[in-house]
Interface confidence: low
């Protein structure tokens, strides 16, 4: 999906509004510094694609995430203010729910959250000019 | 210990071009933007642009889109800003700084590299 | 274009307190940045997002910012903190945007 037509102001009132306070209640308990940010995006529908391959594509030691509270809130988020978005998402979900699994809060999940929040951070803070 | 180190001083004419490194050392290279930022004798500090490491983009500030070019070589954790059609004022001390991913400040120079433009 | 302005210089007496101030529209809703530089050498980070101080940067440096202005106050000054001044900030579509610098001279 090519996020360039998202309207990013009303994702980022999203994120301030709700998200990241779901960002930061899944890491309670967890130091600020116990991870290092290794994922990057230079500017926002980069970030956006980032963002979403690290919310809902299942990775190696962390399954879970697509249905966590932040994840919904972003997911309904894209679907609303990105024209076409719901669409591309249809058969990913349905797979989804096929693999439901036991939530599990694992370290690798926490890392991936961490990582998550730098991305929305660089989200609302832009080095590169919006094209 | 973390360090951005920069090549020597050069001495360039008027229509020429110059390529500076910045070899970074003691962290993860890919892990951070490096920036530029120049000062010319005696004036104030100017932000040139950025280059991320992790995928080679870049963003250059206005006033030198079209004559500034900046890359990186991550297997010697090197970055490169090269700097084209020079003029006088040009001559200037060219910094690299790492930013800081996570709040976007400037938390590590380079110790600069003069670059004379004369004919 | 983003414009930050700076005082060209501040004087001070050891142990009083230095502001420096930097303004800029609406200021406030950005983060801003300050950087000492001394003669010869390569600028330092003192501090971040308005009002953070990096490790290693005495508790004297502080830093403020709303409206249309940020200020870096040193309490205590030194005079080893004689050095020049920037503020620094993003902007959308100007990218990186220093001020012009302040000169603190310790009397």
């Known amino acids: 999906y090519d996020f360039t037509n998202c309207d990013f102001e009303k994702i980022k009132a999203a994120y301030l509004s709700t998200i990241s306070k779901d960002l930061i209640t899944y890491m309670s308990g967890t130091k600020s510094t116990e991870f290092n940010n290794t994922v990057s995006c230079s500017n926002r529908p980069h970030c956006l694609t980032e963002i979403q391959s690290l919310t809902f594509n299942p990775t190696a030691g962390c399954a879970s995430l697509a249905k966590e509270m932040f994840a919904m809130k972003t997911k309904a988020a894209l679907a609303i203010w990105c024209p076409g978005y719901s669409e591309t998402q249809i058969n990913a979900t349905q797979a989804m729910k096929k693999r439901r699994k036991r939530k599990v809060t694992t370290n690798k999940c926490l890392e991936q959250v961490s990582q998550l929040q730098g991305l929305w951070r660089r989200f609302n803070r832009p080095l590169l000019k919006q094209q | 210990q973390v360090q951005l180190v920069q090549s020597g001083a050069e001495v360039k004419k008027p229509g020429a071009s110059v390529k500076v490194s910045c070899k970074a050392s003691g962290y993860t290279f890919t892990g951070y933007y490096m920036h530029w930022v120049r000062q010319a004798p005696g004036q104030g500090l100017e932000w040139m642009g950025w280059?991320?490491?992790?995928?080679?983009?870049?963003n250059y500030g206005q006033k030198f889109q079209g004559r500034v070019t900046m890359t990186r070589d991550t297997s010697i954790s090197t970055a490169y800003m090269e700097l084209s059609r020079l003029r006088s004022d040009d001559t200037a001390v060219y910094y690299c700084?790492?930013?800081?991913?996570?709040?976007?400040?400037?938390?590590?120079w380079g110790q600069g590299t003069m670059v004379t433009v004369s004919s | 274009s983003y414009e930050l302005t700076q005082s060209p210089s501040v004087s001070v007496s050891p142990g009083q307190t230095a502001s420096i101030t930097c303004s800029g529209d609406?200021?406030?809703?950005?983060?801003a940045f300050w950087y000492q530089q001394k003669p010869g050498q390569s600028p330092v980070l003192v501090i971040y997002q308005d009002s953070k101080r990096p490790s290693g940067i005495p508790e004297r440096f502080s830093g403020s910012n709303s409206g249309n202005t940020a200020t870096l106050t040193i309490s205590g000054t030194q005079a080893m903190d004689e050095a020049d001044y920037y503020c620094?900030?993003?902007?959308?579509?100007?990218?990186?945007?220093f001020g012009g610098g302040t000169k603190l001279t310790v009397l």
């Open positions: 620094q900030a993003w902007d959308s579509s100007a990218g990186g945007v």
């Open positions: 700084a790492r930013g800081n991913w996570n709040d976007d400040a400037f938390d590590i």
């Open positions: 280059i991320n490491p992790n995928n080679g983009g870049t």
């Open positions: 609406k200021l406030g809703d950005k983060f």
